[in-house]
């Protein structure tokens, strides 16, 4: 960076090298060049010479003033016009940054994705800070009072093997950067309550020729959790509103869900599950498209990504569910 150059003087920023976006700032340049009394001192921002708001302070120092500085990052350097020198002499350079102090982290969420071996904690960091912001995730056992801290710049994966202090914990997040520090509210968790089942995947769909044609969606999960509640949402691709079916599911076999759909229309399906009665849902599965036929022939669609563990499983039963209409987005 610009800060690694050999300096013949000194450049500094007031109030600081990292400052709040929108502030007025002063950049000072002081030459210290052998046998050079600078006739002029010049400032450059990102390689472009500044022409205004430069004040000579004394024989070796000049100040550049910026009002309402809004750039997240800039490389500044200054030069001297030395008599008897044919070109400007570099004095020094500095990278400057503007941004915001962190917001209070909120919506702290910790989940354990089945088979992952990790507890994943996320949070809403708030508005963009533009500057390097670090987060310390505090995990305190409510049984042993032991506290562990994890440093990260976004989310954190904590090995469940390291959670030796029982099942109940307090989790909170501290956000800090050069401009400030904030701390979230404490989240109380029980490890058994935050498990999210292994992802549910739609494998294929078929429309059966019958008096009233029906579409069967085949879907499955590798979860070992016994009591699982799922939702499948679907809509015509031209629609805004989702329809949602709810299921109480036992994944000892591939699930089949029946739908009575309009002919010759492209539909999109997604599924998600949670451990029954718990708080957190899986994210919605990837989009599965199926176009219903114009008339009677049987049509089969397959998922874009057809995992091998879905192959060769026999259909053991058909699940049915309750139909609701859903305008909700993804719920975590």
């Amino acid at each position: 960076g610009i800060t690694n150059i050999n300096c013949s003087g000194h450049i500094w920023v007031e109030p600081a090298t990292i400052f709040k976006m929108g502030m007025n700032i002063s950049i000072y340049c002081q030459a210290a060049i052998k046998n050079c009394q600078p006739r002029k001192l010049h400032f450059y921002k990102n390689g472009i010479k500044e022409r205004f708001q430069i004040t000579r302070i004394n024989k070796t120092t000049a100040r550049l003033w910026y009002k309402n500085f809004l750039e997240p990052h800039a490389s500044m350097y200054c030069t001297a016009e030395c008599p008897k020198h044919f070109q400007e002499t570099l004095i020094c350079g500095k990278d400057i940054s503007s941004g915001y102090p962190p917001d209070i982290p909120d919506e702290v969420t910790c989940v354990i994705y089945e088979y992952s071996g990790n507890m994943t904690c996320t949070w809403n960091a708030g508005k963009l800070t533009y500057i390097d912001t670090k987060y310390v995730v505090h995990v305190k056992s409510l049984e042993t009072e032991e506290e562990q801290q994890y440093l990260t710049s976004s989310y954190i994966n904590i090995s469940t093997d390291s959670l030796q202090g029982g099942k109940k914990y307090l989790v909170w997040v501290q956000a800090a950067n050069a401009l400030g520090m904030e701390e979230s509210k404490q989240l109380q968790i029980h490890l058994d309550d935050i498990v999210i089942p292994s992802a549910a995947v739609i494998s294929r769909a078929e429309t059966i020729n019958a008096t009233v044609p029906k579409t069967i969606i085949y879907w499955d999960s590798q979860t070992t959790i016994e009591k699982v509640s799922c939702e499948m949402r679907y809509k015509a691709t031209t629609n805004q509103t989702w329809n949602v079916k709810e299921f109480d599911t036992n994944f000892t076999y591939v699930q089949q869900s029946e739908f009575y759909l309009e002919p010759n229309i492209k539909y999109v399906f997604q599924v998600r599950c949670q451990e029954t009665g718990k708080r957190y849902w899986q994210p919605w599965s990837s989009l599965f498209f199926h176009k219903t036929p114009e008339t009677v022939p049987q049509v089969t669609s397959k998922a874009f990504q057809h995992d091998t563990w879905n192959s060769g499983l026999t259909v053991a039963s058909i699940s049915t569910g309750h139909l609701t209409s859903d305008n909700r987005g993804d719920i975590g």
């Epitope: 002081q30 030459a31 210290a32 060049i33 052998k34 046998n35 050079c36 009394q37 600078p38 006739r39 002029k40 000579r56 302070i57 004394n58 024989k59 070796t60 030395c82 008599p83 008897k84």
Partner: antibody, heavy 116, light 107 residues
């Protein structure tokens, strides 16, 4: 172009002090390093002191230390040379000059006569 | 302090002559050496800086050479206006020091 205009001849008694002025034009005093050089009658040039831009300070020749000060008035772009406790051997022409590494602009010189 | 020794002290020459003045420093100067011309009752005038660079407006018959401790001012083809006293000066370290001067007079 730098132009340096100095004050006129001064006559002083031994033990007195003298203040020679050097008015700068073409540039501001903040853009120039002013040095002072003297020349006794029939003798060579002798550097007395001046501003060192590398270290940002005024440096004096050892033999004048304690007797010389080099104040500046940036509001009028005038540099001064104060020499106290004058002796007869201080009789000389005193030049202000700008150090643009080396001395490239010179005042016309100010004659100081020290005589009882 | 760095001592600057010029030779000769006086030099008699005629118009058109090639004149050489030498200056020796008591320690190496990294080429921070200047040459001045001074006429009676006038301020010195810069001729050469950084040992060999010609000051703007100075006639090309003046040239400087040398490095380290030994330096030379040469006037190739002396003109009537060149009869004056010449000084070398080091500006490598403080205090700045001058040679004692070389007077170039008419033979």
């Amino acid at each position: 172009q730098v132009h340096l205009v100095q004050s006129g001849t001064e006559v002083r008694k031994p033990g007195a002090s003298v203040k020679v002025s050097c008015k700068v034009s073409g540039y501001t005093l903040n853009e120039l390093a002013i040095h002072w050089v003297r020349q006794a009658p029939g003798k060579g040039l002798e550097w007395m002191g001046g501003f060192d831009p590398e270290h940002g300070e005024i440096i004096y020749a050892q033999r004048f230390q304690g007797r010389i000060t080099l104040p500046e008035d940036t509001s009028t772009d005038t540099a001064y040379m104060d020499l106290v406790n004058l002796r007869s051997e201080d009789t000389a022409v005193y030049f202000c000059t700008t150090e643009a590494a080396p001395f490239d602009y010179w005042g016309q010189g100010s004659l100081v006569i020290v005589s009882s | 302090d760095i001592q600057m020794t010029q030779s000769p002290s006086t030099l008699s020459a005629s118009v058109g002559d090639r004149v050489t003045i030498t200056c020796r420093a008591s320690q190496s100067l990294s080429n921070w050496l200047a040459w001045y011309q001074q006429k009676p009752g006038k301020a010195p005038k810069l001729l050469i800086y950084k040992a060999s660079s010609l000051e703007s407006g100075v006639p090309s018959r003046f040239s400087g050479s040398g490095s380290g401790t030994d330096f030379t001012l040469t006037i190739s083809g002396l003109q009537p206006d060149d009869f004056a006293t010449y000084y070398c000066q080091q500006y490598d370290i403080y205090p700045r020091t001058f040679g004692q001067g070389t007077k170039v007079e008419i033979k």
